[in-house]
């Protein structure tokens, strides 16, 4: 009987490796054989590997090649979700904000109007979140309807008190005596002006971050194509065919194995880096007018300027709607107009703050600053998975894709792969399909924030200025102007208090690639937005 | 499968920190909130706060702010809650489970406060 | 705080029994979203807490059927149709939707 073959002559390491992988040995040879069925890992001499091992690596280098992705992106990925998640409740709580201080403007200078008027603000930045989120609705028709509605309140209970209830039914008539006769002034168009540039720019702004989120969720479930997965098997797994397990792919063909495997991925970079750019140009311009936070805020004290406009010229305005609307008075018009010092409350308006709190933009222009380190994401990639998987240091004693080797060589790797496929066509195929659709996206969100940019500077007051409207002192400092024009004017440090807990407003179960089936998680909501 | 293991039982005196920990094993660590729960025969079941590991906010019971901190690991996939300033009281049995809807608790620990 | 009320305290029942707890809320538990965050929970001596229904009606993996709650806003039940010597132990009630999250006192279900 012979002597049996010295261990490196068996396939023992070879076999209690794959056995990890898939186990059950029936596919592992117990000694080398020629492996003339091998597709991937064509060999120079005898094999540990067969067929079936082959397709297995293929499976596992695939898998291995999507985690290495999900995790390259994990930290870009959670910066986005986590911040469209803070962002939109930040936003919510500023309209929540605004609706509060208008109805306690309501409250404290007009008691009479309470009832109705709370109605209609409420259903007003109703509106308005709902805008932000996306809603088809047009904001001069909301703005519009704000008035149209106060003003048959402010005419009966305030300018003409008694007007008998039998007349009420003048209300159509009021509503449109309202525009014509521009009771309110110049007011509801300033606000109409200042309200949609900040929720324009508001609602693209959400939608930009929530692109962004689509954008890496969709690169990272990319299924790789099986040459690529030929390619990776060939780096990460033919060296064990030959028994060489602990032998590290050279840094250089990683590099090009993974440009191989990428090129469709990575054609999104140009379009990745423009979206971060105009992004932060879009930031960049977020303040006063187009800053929802400045502006809602100081909704309530432009709303009640409006209404002071109203009475001042009830007199006027009395007697032209009395015969515009043909309705008996039954007495005098009595003015409800209150002394100046009563109009602003200052203990109900004022904002809680903190010193040095954190506002709302100061929050935007960090997240670009974040994202601006993710800025090569994409170009980057390569390099990256290569460095956070196994490779040799300095290409020294390496895995070429066929042997080991003391240095790597790209020419004498890819003439040893001109047998077994194309580098070259892997690269020509262009993107897959869903790379393509979620490019074409980033092309049109870019398009889309660019148009929205600001324009910088003076140029704002002036662009304010031609549409005849008064454009303040205020200055960019963290002190902004709260309000339109009038001695009704209030500053407020700091509009919103930023609470800490709202960075973690993540509720990550949602996000798609997680793979907790037997979890009852469906439509969860996360703690931190309790 | 989902398992959460906890560390031993402690025995504490009073005035003293205690440091409890919670490994995950058999899901992604950093996608689920980790929660605190509290069980005496006195009070029953009590929630403490929860850590996001994936971001590392917090969020706490108004009664156990200053007693108990929750920290995450995302390395070792361990969560961690310390208690400091013991006293009687905090002697119970502490859980940390995962949330969605506590489907998965550890085995609890029990802290022990006694000169 | 949100204050979870059990009732009863003790529920003594036969084997093959039905058995019914009731939990009621100081404020609705539903979410903006239409869900409804209420959990019910079995704890046997020595053991952890185990997940039975979720979001007042589902019934977690592996619960058998004789297990059923239902409810809304503020008032919810939990149902066991026959029940079994497995089943006896603390049942509790619990909430996710305020923070800070609160249990009920718990309902020990015994043999009669």
């Known amino acids: 009987q012979p002597p049996p073959p010295p261990p490196d002559a068996t396939c023992h390491q070879v076999r209690s490796f794959f056995q990890r992988l898939q186990p059950g040995l029936k596919w592992v040879p117990e000694t080398p054989v020629p492996g003339s069925d091998l597709q991937v890992c064509l060999p120079k001499g005898p094999t540990c590997c067969s067929r079936k091992m082959e397709e297995k690596y293929q499976l596992t280098a695939r898998l291995n090649m999507e985690q290495l992705l999900q995790s390259a992106s994990m930290e870009l990925k959670f910066l986005i979700i986590q911040n469209a998640a803070v962002f939109q409740e930040a936003f919510e709580i500023v309209v929540r904000h605004a609706k509060n201080y208008t109805n306690a403007m309501f409250k404290n200078n007009y008691p009479s109007l309470t009832p109705q008027a709370f109605e209609f603000v409420g259903e007003f930045f109703t509106d308005v979140s709902l805008y932000i989120l996306g809603s088809d609705i047009n904001v001069d028709d909301m703005v519009n309807e704000l008035f149209d509605s106060l003003f048959p309140v402010i005419y009966t209970q305030l300018m003409n008190p008694g007007l008998p209830d039998s007349a009420l039914d003048i209300n159509e008539c009021l509503r449109g005596a309202r525009r014509d006769l521009k009771v309110f002034g110049n007011f509801p168009k300033l606000i109409m002006t200042q309200v949609s540039k900040s929720l324009q720019v508001t609602r693209i702004f959400l939608q930009a971050l929530n692109l962004g989120i689509e954008v890496i969720n969709t690169t990272d479930h990319l299924k790789f194509s099986k040459d690529c997965g030929r390619m990776l098997t060939r780096m990460w797994y033919c060296s064990y065919c030959q028994g060489l397990m602990m032998v590290k792919p050279c840094g250089g063909y990683c590099n090009v194995v993974m440009q191989g495997c990428m090129a469709g991925v990575v054609e999104i970079d140009k379009y990745w880096r423009e979206y971060i750019l105009s992004l932060e140009e879009l930031v960049n311009g977020m303040y006063r007018i187009y800053d929802m936070e400045n502006v809602l805020l100081g909704l309530f004290s432009t709303i009640h300027d409006s209404i002071q406009y109203v009475q001042k010229n009830a007199g006027k305005l009395t007697t032209t709607i009395g015969k515009l609307c043909a309705h008996s008075q039954q007495r005098q018009y009595r003015s409800a107009y209150y002394p100046e010092d009563l109009f602003i409350d200052k203990k109900v308006l004022k904002v809680a703050h903190v010193e040095h709190e954190e506002t709302l933009s100061s929050r935007r222009r960090e997240l670009i600053q974040k994202l601006k380190s993710f800025i090569s994401f994409y170009s980057a990639l390569p390099g990256y998975i290569c460095s956070h998987s196994p490779v040799a240091e300095n290409d020294t004693l390496c895995w070429n894709g066929q042997e080991l080797v003391e240095r790597y060589s790209q020419k004498a790797a890819r003439n040893g792969m001109k047998n077994q496929f194309n580098l070259h066509e892997l690269k020509m195929k262009g993107p897959e399909p869903v790379v393509s659709q979620i490019i074409d996206k980033l092309k049109h969100i870019n398009q889309l924030l660019r148009t929205m940019s600001m324009p910088k500077g003076r140029v704002l007051d002036k662009n304010l200025d031609e549409e005849g409207f008064e454009s303040g002192d205020c200055g960019d400092d963290e002190d902004e102007c709260i309000g339109g024009s009038g001695d009704g004017m209030i500053k407020v440090k700091n509009q919103l208090r930023f609470l800490a807990e709202l960075a973690y407003d993540l509720d990550v179960d949602d996000a798609p690639g997680n793979s907790q089936q037997a979890t009852p998680k469906d439509n969860e909501i996360s703690t931190f937005h309790n | 499968q989902v398992q959460l293991q906890q560390s031993g039982a402690e025995l504490v005196r009073p005035g003293a920190s205690v440091k409890l920990s919670c490994k995950a094993l058999g899901y992604t660590f950093t996608d689920y909130e980790m929660h605190w729960v509290k069980q005496t025969p006195v009070h029953g079941l009590e929630w403490i706060g929860a850590i996001h590991p994936g971001s590392g906010g917090t969020a706490y019971n108004q009664k156990f702010k200053g007693k108990a901190t929750l920290t995450a690991d995302k390395f070792s996939s361990t969560g961690y809650m310390e208690l400091s300033s013991l006293t009687s009281e905090d002697s119970a049995v502490y859980y940390c489970t995962r949330y969605y809807s506590y489907a998965y608790w550890g085995q609890g620990t029990l802290v022990t406060v006694s000169a | 705080d949100v204050v979870m009320t059990q009732t009863p305290l003790s529920l003594p029942v036969s084997l093959g029994d039905q058995a019914s707890i009731s939990c009621r809320s100081s404020?609705?538990?539903?979410?903006?979203?239409?869900?409804?965050?209420l959990q019910w929970y079995l704890q046997k001596p020595g053991q952890s807490p185990k997940l039975l229904i979720y979001?007042?009606?589902n019934r977690f993996s592996g619960v058998p059927d004789r297990f059923s709650g239902s409810g809304s806003g503020t008032d919810f039940i939990l149902k066991i149709s026959r029940v079994e010597a497995e089943d006896l132990g603390v049942y509790f009630c619990?909430?996710?939707?305020?923070?800070?999250?609160?249990f009920g006192g718990g309902t020990k279900l015994e043999i009669k």
């Open positions: 619990f909430q996710s939707i305020h923070v800070p999250y609160t």
């Open positions: 979001k007042v009606s």
């Open positions: 404020q609705s538990l539903v979410h903006s979203n239409g869900n409804t965050y």
